[in-house]
């Protein structure tokens, strides 16, 4: 259906990490342009990325208004020189996206180990609380602010001389672990939302090892 010189968008895909959310689609336009609309299940449609030749649209500003809502987007196709033109049914061609619930589906970004400090046989490892684009009272919320106790971190730690990785977990951003005195350890963290069934884990943080800059040692 639709006009002979436009094709409907397809492969509409949500790409979202720490709530930065972009809708992508195909095909690359030939003599056509796109406009995107987004809505919650019960809300009104809002237009974004008007008459664009891009095949992506940043919808972050819309979804961060309520990350627990479920959103639907649609991509309209128009002839490049005649955006008023409509399909055979009297309206432009469009394709719907899959539904998207940011709180349940946004990918967890790669965490960063902010610091570690050794005091005797204890090491305190701190994970950076990454800022998101979700706002409350004009301030950007951190990942922990948004997810609360739903978000946990797994720490993998190992002696530099060994391969076996011990684990520790926290629902804050800090770990306090026991280590052997005189041994150097390496650390990596992973963000996890255990209540999820998909997109449960982030990729691992870069590995940080004792004896490098981020660490501090006190007897």
């Amino acid at each position: 259906s639709g006009t002979t010189n436009t094709v409907a968008a397809y492969n509409l895909t949500w790409k979202s990490t720490n709530f930065k959310t972009i809708l992508e689609w195909e095909p690359k336009p030939v003599n056509q342009v796109y406009t995107v609309q987004i809505s919650t299940k019960s809300g009104d449609w809002k237009s974004k990325c008007f008459y664009t030749t891009d095949t992506e649209c940043d919808l972050t500003d819309e979804i961060v208004k309520d990350v627990k809502q479920t959103y639907l987007a649609r991509v309209f196709s128009y002839p490049a020189g005649n955006v008023e033109s409509t399909g055979s049914a009297g309206e432009p061609l469009y394709e719907n996206s899959p539904e998207f619930t940011p709180y349940l589906e946004t990918n967890l970004g790669q965490p960063t180990i902010q610091s570690f400090e050794q005091v005797g046989t204890k090491v305190n490892v701190t994970v950076e609380d990454e800022r998101t684009l979700v706002r409350r009272n004009n301030t950007f919320l951190s990942l922990r602010d948004v997810f609360g106790k739903d978000l946990i971190y797994t720490l993998y730690y190992w002696k530099s001389s060994s391969s076996g990785k011990k684990t520790a977990k926290t629902n804050t951003n800090e770990f306090l672990i026991d280590v052997d005195k005189g041994e150097n350890y390496c650390f990596s963290v992973q963000a996890v939302i255990p209540s999820r069934t998909v997109n449960r884990k982030s990729t691992d943080s870069p590995v940080e090892c004792m004896g490098q800059e981020k660490g501090e040692f006190r007897e």
Partner: antibody, heavy 120, light 107 residues
Framework: EVQLVESGGGLVQPGGSLRLSCAAS????????IHWVRQAPGKGLEWVGY????????YHADSVKGRFTISADTSKNTAYLQMNSLRAEDTAVYYC?????????????WGQGTLVTVSS | DIQMTQSPSSLSASVGDRVTITCRAS??????VAWYQQKPGKAPKLLIY???FLYSGVPSRFSGSRSGTDFTLTISSLQPEDFATYYC?????????FGQGTKVEIK
Amino acid sequence: EVQLVESGGGLVQPGGSLRLSCAASGFTISGYIIHWVRQAPGKGLEWVGYIDPSNGYTYHADSVKGRFTISADTSKNTAYLQMNSLRAEDTAVYYCARDDQSVSSPFDYWGQGTLVTVSS
Amino acid sequence: DIQMTQSPSSLSASVGDRVTITCRASQDVNTAVAWYQQKPGKAPKLLIYSASFLYSGVPSRFSGSRSGTDFTLTISSLQPEDFATYYCQQHYTTPPTFGQGTKVEIK
């Protein structure tokens, strides 16, 4: 439905090798941690080791270190326990279990177990 | 490694009895303790996690509590299907460790 199915057990001579498989369905193993636990006849539960299939990280119990190796193939949604240099004391039912990776990390689903007998 | 000392190793009880099993951790494990039930020839089943939270589908006669490094599993009114072996487990640190088990038998 979440399911774990172990296979590969059997009778093996001391010093021999065996590879156990743990096939998962109803969930993706890369989102969880998979543990191996064993139980000698009439005895309690003994933890053998774990793998995080998302990064390949493992840890093995001292009793099996250097002899057993845990691995995973995420494309097959399966974890493995490679057992070498087997001893009579390795005779047990071997279970794989899923760790939900919450703060308390209970093993929320277990396989039915596969029996490994090491005997000449 | 953290030791989990479970007691008693076995007990005899009747249907309707209140049954208590305890586990003592050799060091602080916070609330990272789970309890499992195992019947002969079967895999263990999760009953309690985070020391006191009832796992989905587990009858409310099962409960768990913590006092420092002491953990308790209570069955408020023993049912015929509850005759089994029970294990505690800590997963506060690697390696996770199990208690020796408590066999609950019919008196």
